[in-house]
């Protein structure tokens, strides 16, 4: 499978937003690429979001997706929003070169995203 690189650890912002780069080494001249973010907890793998894009065009996730992203060459900048402490876990970038053949697939080692819920603001008496 293709080599896919992603950072080992990312800390989500206080607003529950985490961003990381997923970079792949393309063996060929793909025109259609599919990027999927998977969350792995123990032996369970769930799909967080997915997008297919044409090389040179923007990455488009579904309207209700918690992910957004941009692409540049063999690099995809992914942002996951709405994260809470319970969403802390390993997020894996999966890249598939869909067209033209041959089909190639690559799996990153995963990015451990840490999410810390913000402390509620104490009531202030002025």
């Amino acid at each position: 499978a293709m080599h896919v690189a992603q950072p080992a650890v990312v800390l989500a912002s206080s607003r529950g937003i985490a961003s990381f780069v997923c970079e792949y080494a393309s063996p060929g001249k793909a025109t259609e690429v599919r990027v999927t973010v998977l969350r792995q907890a123990d032996s369970q793998v769930t799909e967080v979001c997915a997008a297919t894009y044409m090389m040179g065009n923007e990455l488009t996730f579904l309207d209700d997706s918690i992910c957004t992203g941009t692409s540049s060459g063999n690099q995809v900048n992914l942002t996951i929003q709405g994260l809470r402490a319970m969403d802390t876990g390993l997020y894996i970038c999966k890249v598939e070169l869909m067209y033209p053949p041959p089909y190639y697939l690559g799996i990153g080692n995963g990015t451990q995203i840490y999410v810390i819920d913000p402390e509620p603001c104490p009531d202030s008496d002025f």
């Epitope: 060929g28 001249k29 793998v45 053949p101 041959p102 799996i107």
Partner: antibody
Framework: EVQLVESGGGLVQPGRSLRLSCTAS????????MNWVRQAPGKGLEWVGQ??????????YYSDSVKGRFTISRDDSKSIAYLQMNSLKTEDTAVYYC??????WGQGTTVTVSS | DIQMTQSPSSLSASVGDRVTITCGAS??????LNWYQQKPGKSPKLLIY???NLADGVPSRFSGSGSGTDFTLTISSLQPEDVATYYC??????????FGGGTKVEIK
């Protein structure tokens, strides 16, 4: 039209060597990782090995059953992949297929190892 | 190495039946799985790539599903020309890209 044509098969004695060739046409050979897959008579498919392409430094991988005896190489200028088989054993008797990626398959060439 | 276990090893079904073949991986393979069809005396042909994607020219009665470790090939309405042996294959690095043992499909 995509074509993969294997050649070089035949009858060989145990311990001897044989080189198979896979000539490709109809697709961009240099974009493809080339694989060899074999099938013993009446048995299932067995992945033999793989050679990746230039962006992957022509890395090679082999199944444990052939490691150290078989070598895969390629010539992108001629669109040919090779399988060099040394120290052949009777259990290497099979139809050998080459594949481009895993999308395109040749028709196979038969290798019989027997004394 | 990751092992691929296919079941059943053979099955017999009637024309029009829904046929399901399963393939299990000994570890998570993230959908890195292909399915092939091999008709008697012929070379294998790619049917499904990446667990769910239908290869070019393959009839829509074939479909693939699954993720993680468990995968399924379904023929929604078996046709006489579907008589063949079907194989799954793990395509996740590092190699070996192991095949399942195969499932022989026959018509009753």
């Amino acid at each position: 039209e995509v074509q993969l044509v294997e050649s070089g098969g035949g009858l060989v004695q145990p311990g001897r060597s044989l080189r198979l060739s896979c000539t490709a046409s109809g697709f961009t050979f240099s974009d493809n990782w080339m694989n060899w897959v074999r099938q013993a008579p009446g048995k299932g498919l067995e992945w033999v090995g793989q050679i990746r392409n230039k962006p992957y430094n022509y890395e090679t991988y082999y199944s444990d059953s052939v490691k150290g005896r078989f070598t895969i190489s390629r010539d992108d200028s001629k669109s040919i992949a090779y399988l060099q088989m040394n120290s052949l054993k009777t259990e290497d008797t099979a139809v050998y297929y080459c594949t481009g990626g895993m999308d395109y398959w040749g028709q196979g060439t038969t290798v019989t190892v027997s004394s | 190495d990751i092992q691929m276990t296919q079941s059943p090893s053979s099955l017999s079904a009637s024309v029009g039946d829904r046929v399901t073949i399963t393939c299990g991986a000994s570890e998570i393979i993230y959908g890195a799985l292909n399915w092939y069809q091999q008709k008697p005396g012929k070379s294998p042909k790619l049917l499904i790539y990446g667990a769910t994607n239908l290869a070019d020219g393959v009839p829509s009665r074939f479909s693939g599903s699954g993720s993680g470790t468990d995968f399924t090939l379904t023929i929604s309405s078996l046709q006489p020309e579907d008589v063949a042996t079907y194989y799954c294959q793990k395509i996740l690095s590092p190699p070996p890209w192991t095949f399942g043992g195969g499932t022989k499909v026959e018509i009753k």
